[in-house]
């Protein structure tokens, strides 16, 4: 290369003024389903799921932390956020996921990925997948998948809400999951 | 810029200690559906799809290779992996995809993205999309989409398995596909 | 570091020959649904949706522009492209989304993400999600999600086409959306 003199130092990436950063160093998380403990929630408010964050296929890295149903965004930027929730219903009375007289054949199933910002009282719905249920068989199951890119701020919190927590299939980590990564 | 002397060399990306790399240089693949040749498989084992890797919209690049139904991971890191499989069923006896007396109206349809590690015979299921089928019409069709991020090791292999290969819509490259890219 | 002499200049990223670039500087867009104005379209040609590109969750950045139903690709490279369209149908005659005697209970619903290249007259279908509709209830709704990676050229244009514009749920920005980002 020879000695670098005067204006001769012109590496191919000189056009970049924002700090570069190694990709492996970006905040990332993939969370997987766990058995849900039924919690009290308001009638028109969808309950939030809680997640596994370190066993099996689940992980959080590079300051992306999971705590109390929330993914915490450690750095401002554009994130790709995704989730799949597999729902299942059984008309059999003895079904483990049938609870407290709640019908196991709902009119609809819904997943919402929600952003909470501490400085703003009202959560923001980022993504919604909603489907009417017209299964005619006694046992039914189906996934709802969501994914998109959003500009998030350091300190934002993400959660996944569902229309009926008792219908979520928690039996396998590959069926119901939630993740985000900085682009 | 002038000559670089002493401690004056401090580009804006000095905080990065891991090697930086150009994004266009990362392993990537998008594979598209081809007509499947029916293969023998065990009763409780879902068959793997094979794929187009270089014609039309399909490609592999930067050491990501496709061989014998598998995507080969050339470099350890976090990958986003996705697939869509469109299923279709027809009750008409003359249907091209009706095979060997197998009913074309299944109870369910399932897609699994599976990781295989050479040092271990048992595959790991990364993603599963499974849906009960209760279509009442004679002809039905629907997609299952999956996508998420996983930490993979150099040498890992990825495949897509389905519950019934005869129900996969192989007619168009935009309907059924499989891809992965290093983040 | 000392003065840089001779061959001593060997930073850890010297293996990168393509220009490096800051991630925050890449073309990106997330577009959200707006109420569609019914337009004339040919019988066998699916109409394109138009989108919100700057209000609410919608944004375009780094030379990715939206104009007249199209996302304009400002730079060649590999892009992840995604869309969700939520469809809904109501059998009630007074339904706002029931139009011009068109039946509101279609046989199928379809979303296509299409690439248009000015130098080539025929659009390329990149992604298709298509589903037969066999809902038995009077009101039905469901999303179709698509996402994959494609190699695009500067000047390419992307749009989202649907089988029936009158069935698209435009009521909420989190239900129906379209986005792309350079990897």
């Amino acid at each position: 290369m020879g000695a670098l003199k005067g204006q001769e130092f012109a590496p191919s990436h000189q056009q970049v003024y924002a700090p570069l950063r190694a990709d492996g160093d970006k905040p990332r998380a993939h969370l997987t389903v766990v058995r849900q403990t039924p919690t009290q929630h308001f009638k028109n408010q969808f309950p939030a799921l809680h997640w596994e964050h370190e066993l099996g296929l689940a992980f959080t890295k590079n300051r992306m932390n999971y705590t109390n149903k929330f993914l915490l965004i450690p750095e401002s930027g554009d994130y790709f956020i995704y989730s799949q929730v597999t729902f299942r219903g059984m008309t059999s009375e003895s079904s483990e996921i049938r609870q407290a007289g709640r019908p196991n054949k709902p009119d609809s199933i819904t997943v919402v990925i929600t952003k909470v910002t501490d400085s703003y009282p009202e959560p923001t719905q980022l993504l919604m997948g909603t489907k009417s249920v017209s299964e005619v068989g006694s046992n039914w199951f189906q996934p709802i998948y969501l994914g998109a890119m959003f500009s998030l701020q350091e300190g934002d919190k993400l959660m996944v809400n569902v229309s009926d927590i008792s219908l979520v299939d928690y039996t396998k980590e590959d069926k119901t999951f939630f993740g985000a990564f900085l682009l | 810029m002038g000559a670089l002397k002493g401690q004056e060399f401090a580009p804006s990306h000095q905080q990065v200690y891991a090697p930086l790399r150009a994004d266009g240089d990362k392993p990537r693949a998008h594979l598209t559906v081809v007509r499947q040749t029916p293969t023998q498989h065990f009763k409780n084992q879902f068959p793997a799809l094979h794929w187009e890797h270089e014609l039309g919209l399909a490609f592999t690049k930067n050491r990501m290779n496709y061989t014998n139904k598998f995507l080969l991971i050339p470099e350890s890191g976090d990958y986003f992996i996705y697939s869509q499989v469109t299923f279709r069923g027809m009750t008409s006896e003359s249907s091209e995809i009706r095979q060997a007396g197998r009913p074309n109206k299944p109870d369910s349809i399932t897609v699994v993205i599976t990781k295989v590690t050479d040092s271990y015979p048992e595959p790991t299921q990364l993603l599963m999309g499974t849906k009960s089928v209760s279509e009442v019409g004679s002809n039905w069709f629907q997609p299952i989409y999956l996508g998420a991020m996983f930490s993979l090791q150099e040498g890992d292999k990825l495949m897509v398995n389905v519950s019934d290969i005869s129900l996969v819509d192989y007619t168009k490259e935009d309907k059924t596909f499989f891809g992965a890219f290093l983040l | 570091m000392g003065a840089l002499k001779g061959q001593e200049f060997a930073p850890s990223h010297q293996q990168v020959y393509a220009p490096l670039r800051a991630d925050g500087d890449k073309p990106r867009a997330h577009l959200t649904v707006v109420r569609q104005t019914p337009t004339q379209h040919f019988k066998n040609q699916f109409p394109a949706l138009h989108w919100e590109h700057e209000l609410g969750l919608a944004f375009t950045k780094n030379r990715m522009n939206y104009t007249n139903k199209f996302l304009l690709i400002p730079e060649s490279g590999d892009y992840f492209i995604y869309s969700q369209v939520t469809f809904r149908g109501m059998t009630s005659e007074s339904s706002e989304i029931r139009q011009a005697g068109r039946p509101n209970k279609p046989d199928s619903i379809t979303v296509v993400i299409t690439k248009v290249t000015d130098s080539y007259p025929e659009p390329t279908q990149l992604l298709m999600g298509t589903k037969s509709v066999s809902e038995v209830g009077s009101n039905w709704f469901q999303p179709i999600y698509l996402g994959a990676m494609f190699s695009l050229q500067e000047g390419d244009k992307l749009m989202v086409n649907v089988s029936d514009i009158s069935l698209v749920d435009y009521t909420k920005e989190d239900k129906t959306f379209f986005g792309a980002f350079l990897l």
Partner: antibody, heavy 124, light 107 residues
Framework: EVQLVESGGGLVQPGGSLRLSCAAS????????ISWVRQAPGKGLEWVAW????????HYARMLQGRFTISRDNAKNSLYLQMNSLRAEDTAVYYC?????????????????WGQGTTVTVSS | EIVLTQSPATLSLSPGERATLSCRAS??????LAWYQQKPGQAPRLLIY???NRATGIPARFSGSGSGTDFTLTISSLEPEDFAVYYC?????????FGQGTKVEIK
């Protein structure tokens, strides 16, 4: 055959250091977490540390945090326990054990595969 | 940290008898409790995971029950090879912790 084989034990003086290794074979190393568990002579089992071979997350027994470091090398299917500032009370048989999560949100699993153990003696 | 207390410390029984071992947690561990068997000079062996699920290859005479803070391992009819030390382990909260063990010896 699924196997864990520990090595690296031995006699070390108080204040000294030792690095234990655990070589795994016969399974997908990156999927299952691994714990180190120790057993002092004539005593019960004591959990020492855990690592996710998948993502590198770690947890330690409170009394040992700061002196012991668990790590892994996925390319070598190997796990390590670096033990510093050793004390007489660290004398034990050290086992590595695979943590089976069973891939289900319904379960937390258990340690389903154990090595034969390696003996660490801290004495002057 | 969660403390697990096993009782009794020693259980003296004859082959063919029923053994009932108890494990009590200082706070709820849901169903996230495992049981292990250890024989002299050997590594422990997983018997039961998640309170009631038998591990691969474990005979049906071993069963587990309980949730929250109180758990039981039952050996319906003791075989000669079952005389050993049994440990419970909670897997609900870090750090994982073991009980002090129950020794099942031949009467």
């Amino acid at each position: 055959e699924v196997q864990l084989v520990e090595s690296g034990g031995g006699l070390v003086q108080p204040g000294g250091s030792l690095r234990l290794s655990c070589a795994a074979s016969g399974y997908d190393f990156t999927y299952y977490g691994i714990s180190w568990v120790r057993q002092a002579p004539g005593k019960g089992l004591e959990w020492v540390a855990w690592i996710s071979t998948y993502n590198g997350n770690t947890h330690y027994a409170r009394m040992l945090q700061g002196r012991f470091t668990i790590s892994r090398d996925n390319a070598k299917n190997s796990l390590y326990l670096q033990m510093n500032s050793l004390r007489a009370e660290d004398t034990a048989v050290y086992y590595c054990a695979r943590e089976n999560y069973y891939g289900s949100g319904a379960y937390r699993g258990g340690m389903d595969v154990w090595g034969q153990g390696t003996t660490v003696t801290v004495s002057s | 940290e969660i403390v697990l207390t096993q009782s009794p410390a020693t259980l003296s029984l004859s082959p063919g008898e029923r053994a009932t071992l108890s494990c009590r947690a200082s706070q709820s561990v849901s169903s996230y409790l495992a049981w292990y068997q250890q024989k002299p000079g050997q590594a422990p062996r997983l018997l039961i995971y998640d309170a009631s699920n038998r591990a691969t290859g474990i005979p049906a005479r071993f069963s587990g029950s309980g949730s929250g803070t109180d758990f039981t391992l039952t050996i319906s009819s003791l075989e000669p090879e079952d005389f050993a030390v049994y440990y419970c382990q909670q897997r609900s909260n870090w750090p994982w912790t073991f009980g002090q063990g129950t020794k099942v010896e031949i009467k």
